[in-house]
């Protein structure tokens, strides 16, 4: 008769993919349909995988997913001609360990962050075999990279500094298949190298060819000399200069520029150590030619007393106010009403007070250092009657 | 000078949808409104709805709302009335008009519906 | 929807004469009325916004004018050029409606 060999009377698992064997001898040797696996529910199960020795048939099953249900009394049947016989195993499914809590920051550096790895409490079963720190910089494309812990306080070392960088743990119990999920992440940012940059930093035209860059007094904390380095580089071109300005200084005048062009300048206070650089700021030169017409121009919600326009404008041309213009038609132009709007973000106004069932002329200009531009094309505006008036 | 082309005639054959054009110079397509209007042979005109480029927004008349579906190309100044499922009933000539106060008109463009 | 009711539907006249086309308006309409021109061709031109701003380049024959909801386009003295057909039209509520028309022949 078959003989079941080399089966434990209990299995400990841990959830996820499993592939059980049942090993059998015996003469004749069972043949794969010979060999069931059967679930405590009673499921039967048929070899997935099959191999015989001269000694042995070996049945290989699969189970995708074992869950802590599937615990209890599995058996293993072989039923051949010359017999059959079962023998019962215990299997007991463990829940993969994830951490509850994210970990810890306890200190930062420029290049280095001192972390509580808080593992406990975690979810699921133990006993722990070992711990896994994962981190990487946030805005980056790269793979997680790990580290074992073996205690709850760990250094990363060899980090990057002024950068934002994600954690987690991820536990493993004993068994294959034991990694857990990893657990809750934390963010964290390391600390800059050198000196934080100027405060209050204010990007201003002055001319078609100067920009002034000011910012607030920089009261050192050391004696070291200090100085604040200016970088200013061009939207359009490519071109790009680094100005040293004293550090007693609060402003400097950045000349030789482009008329109409954007420019991108950042500053930082540098000492023997390169300070940290500020966000960007940038402005435009003022023009040296007349602003485009605004575009995109709307008028709508007409009412017997008044009516909303909209305008865009382009950027880069020192607009600095926008004039409508309107003037009941037919009638003399030095008749007209001027609306001037000095906040050129604005695009939108309500024209109020007009008169009911009246047809007026409306024109829009922008304004800059240069002048104004040139409507060519006026709009109409025909009020609506009183009876209308919602 | 404010000028909007539309083709001459358009032949479609009745069920398959149809997109009908008005080319826009001289003048900002972006800051006036375009209007489309309806004319059937021997009859008088229908206004279908109107189209603001800078922003899309669109006004139809309830009567043409499962009918007519107005876009702009903003690139090409370009405003479109694309007619869905047309029927004999389709057959008109259609114009595009300029502004609120339909101020310029296009030639018209004469859709044929026929099998 | 407001009803633009024009009359009369054709018109026969000799060439000098005084004409006037009239619109009548189902509701208030203020001064939102354009009168508009169309040709033989297809051809559409606006003749008068606001029921009686001039468009340019149109002549001074043409004159629109407004008593309650009766609105009148008349062309002073006609020319051969004229003979073609008239529109009214509302843009004070939506939809905007048409008039149904006047065809101006010559007598």
């Known amino acids: 008769t078959p003989k079941i060999v080399d089966l434990p009377d209990h299995i400990e698992v841990n959830s996820g993919k499993f592939n059980p064997i049942c090993k059998a001898s015996g003469w004749p040797l069972p043949t794969n349909e010979e060999m069931t696996l059967v679930k405590p529910d009673g499921t039967v199960l048929h070899p997935k995988d099959f191999n015989h020795t001269d000694h042995f048939s070996v049945a290989i099953f699969t189970i995708h997913r074992i869950l802590p249900p599937d615990s209890g009394v599995w058996v293993c049947s072989v039923n051949t001609v010359a017999g059959m016989v079962e023998k019962p195993f215990n299997i007991s499914v463990k829940v993969l360990p994830k951490p509850l809590n994210a970990p810890n920051v306890i200190d930062t550096g420029h290049n280095f962050a001192v972390i509580n790895i808080s593992s406990e409490p975690y979810f699921g079963d133990g006993p722990i075999k070992s711990k896994k720190l994962l981190y990487k910089p946030v805005n980056h494309y790269e793979a997680w990279q790990h580290i074992q812990v073996t205690n709850e306080i760990v250094t990363l070392n060899y980090l990057e500094p002024r950068t934002e960088y994600e954690l987690c743990v991820q536990l493993v119990r004993r068994g294959e298949g034991g990694e857990g999920h990893p657990g809750p992440v934390r963010r964290f940012t390391t600390a800059s190298i050198g000196l934080p940059p100027p405060r209050g930093l204010n990007l201003l035209p002055k001319s078609q060819t100067t920009l002034n860059l000011t910012w607030q007094p920089i009261f050192p904390s050391s004696e070291d000399d200090f100085y604040v380095e200016v970088e200013r580089r061009s939207v359009q071109k490519s071109d790009q200069q680094n100005i040293k300005v004293p550090g007693n200084l609060t402003s400097v005048l950045l000349n030789n520029l482009h008329p109409r062009e954007q420019y991108v300048v950042r500053a930082r206070v540098n000492t023997k150590a390169q300070g940290e650089w500020s966000e960007d700021l940038t402005a435009w030169t003022l023009s040296d030619i007349l602003p485009p017409q605004p575009e995109n121009i709307k008028i709508s919600n007409i009412t017997h007393s008044s009516a909303v326009i909209s305008w865009t404008i382009l950027d880069g041309y020192s607009i600095s106010s926008i004039t409508i213009r309107y003037k009941v038609q037919g009638k003399n132009e030095d008749q007209h009403v001027d609306v001037k709007i000095k906040n050129a973000t604005i695009t939108q106004y309500q024209l109020k007070g007009l008169e009911p069932e009246t047809a007026y002329q409306v024109d829009i200009f922008a304004e800059n250092n240069i002048g104004s531009s040139n409507p060519a094309f006026s709009h109409e505006l025909v009020t609506l009657p009183e009876s209308q008036a919602p | 000078q404010v000028q909007l082309q539309q083709p001459g005639a358009e032949l479609v054959r009745p069920g398959a949808s149809v997109k009908l054009s008005c080319k826009a110079s001289?003048?900002?397509?972006?800051?006036?409104?375009m209007n489309w209007v309806k004319q059937r042979p021997g009859q008088g005109l229908e206004w279908i709805g109107m189209?603001?480029?800078?922003?899309?927004?669109?006004r139809l008349n309830q009567k043409f709302k499962d009918k007519a579906t107005l876009t702009v190309d903003k690139s090409s100044s370009t405003a479109y009335m694309q007619l869905s499922s047309p029927t004999s009933e389709d057959s008109a000539v259609y114009y595009c008009?300029?502004?609120?106060?339909?101020?310029?008109w296009g030639q018209g463009t004469t859709l044929t519906v026929s099998s | 929807d407001i009803q633009m009711t024009q009359s009369p539907s054709s018109l026969s006249a000799s060439l000098g004469e005084r004409v006037s086309l009239t619109c009548r308006a189902s509701q208030d309409i203020g001064i939102s009325l354009n009168w508009l021109q169309q040709e033989p061709d297809g051809t559409i031109k606006r003749l008068i916004y606001a029921t009686s701003s001039l468009d340019s380049g149109v002549p001074k024959r043409f004159t629109g004018s407004r008593s309650g909801s009766d609105y009148s386009l008349t062309i002073s003295s006609l020319e051969s050029e004229d003979f073609v057909d008239y529109y009214c039209l509302q843009y004070v509520s939506s939809p905007w409606t048409f008039g149904g028309g006047t065809k101006l022949e010559i007598k």
């Open positions: 001289g003048y900002s397509f972006t800051s006036y409104w």
């Open positions: 008009a300029r502004g609120y106060y339909f101020d310029y």
């Open positions: 189209i603001h480029p800078s922003d899309s927004e669109t």
